[in-house]
Amino acid sequence: KESCDVQLYIKRQSEHSILAGDPFELECPVKYCANRPHVTWCKLNGTTCVKLEDRQTSWKEEKNISFFILHFEPVLPNDNGSYRCSANFQSNLIESHSTTLYVTDVKSASERPSKDEMASRPWLLY
């Protein structure tokens, strides 16, 4: 019998390399059985996760899973950082793993760091 708990499918230590100025959608895949839970996004500031109140979000429904999407239109340099989605379900708060966005500032194409270079930045290691 399949569990009817809400599950948030963000992989542990997931990372995305994105360009400032581009649009980007950060997805929180949500599995639920009956009623869709209330889901929010927050951004980590040290050990505190600050709720993102005034940001554009939307739902995308698929057959077996739904996606709660945080929209970046466009991505800004200060969007760099770690994010987490949370769901309220039967008075329980379920938190996802955090996912990290590495924002590359817009430069000429020849100066843009590759994904591999992004992964080498020591200040991004942890």
Partner: antibody, heavy 119, light 112 residues
């Protein structure tokens, strides 16, 4: 069950490159991380790096940064590790492995690929 | 990088006896999610490594219950309660908390 099959042994000249493949079955690789570890003859294990097949983001140990390139092809459930500027010290068995990205509930290793670097 | 140090480097145990392998990390492996990502691998001669234990003490499916893991923070232990002939192998601890992932140097288990 989850299985990994790696490409066959390679003999390479110093200064050249090698590309090892690793094909997964029994799992949707989007839900995993795939990583590479090497083992020199009679030595211990050394982590090279890992990739998130869902978005292609790869991360490397500092020692291999700029020399190793890990990629993944979701359509064929295959990960690749290319190592350039080979030297004799790169002679080793190269293992790929895959683990569950959400709960780490499984971690499966390939059979290994022996890469010999010799002039 | 986190340094993982195992002791002893090798261990000779009689069949049916208990074997204990220690692993020490240079910093805490407790992650921000409250979990500790410490794994134990077994590598039998001529074979690929195989994960035995994850999250300090959880046994992988199919692993005999004579294997157990314990510890917290920086100090961890793999115990084989009653060594069998098929346990002849090198055992590695490794951490999955921070990048880069790092391994202990390995402990060779021999049968007396």
């Amino acid at each position: 069950q989850v299985q990994l099959v790696q490409s066959g042994a390679e003999v390479k000249k110093p200064g050249s490159s090698v590309k090892v493949s690793c094909k997964a079955s029994g799992v949707n690789i989007k839900d995993t991380y795939m990583y590479w570890v090497r083992q020199a003859p009679g030595q211990g294990l050394e982590w090279i790096g890992r990739i998130d097949p869902a978005n292609g983001y790869a991360r490397y140990a500092q020692k291999f940064q700029g020399r190793a390139t890990i990629t993944a092809d979701e359509s064929t459930s295959t990960a690749y590790m290319e190592l350039s500027s080979l030297r004799s010290e790169d002679t080793a068995v190269y293992y790929c492995a895959v683990y569950d990205g959400y709960y780490e509930s499984f971690d499966v290793w390939g059979q290994g690929t022996l890469v010999t670097v010799s002039s | 990088d986190i340094v993982m140090t195992q002791s002893p480097d090798s261990l000779a145990v009689s069949l049916g006896e208990r074997a204990t392998i220690n692993c020490k990390s240079s910093q805490s492996l407790l992650d921000s999610d409250g979990k500790t990502y410490l794994n134990w691998l077994q590598q039998k001669p001529g074979q690929s490594p195989k994960r035995l234990i994850y999250l300090v003490s959880k046994l992988d499916s199919g692993v005999p219950d004579r294997f157990s893991g314990s510890g917290s923070g920086t100090d961890f232990t793999l115990t084989i309660s009653s060594v069998q002939a098929e346990d002849l192998a090198v055992y590695y601890c490794w951490q999955g908390t921070l990048f880069p992932r790092t391994f202990g140097q390995g402990t060779k288990l021999e049968i007396k």
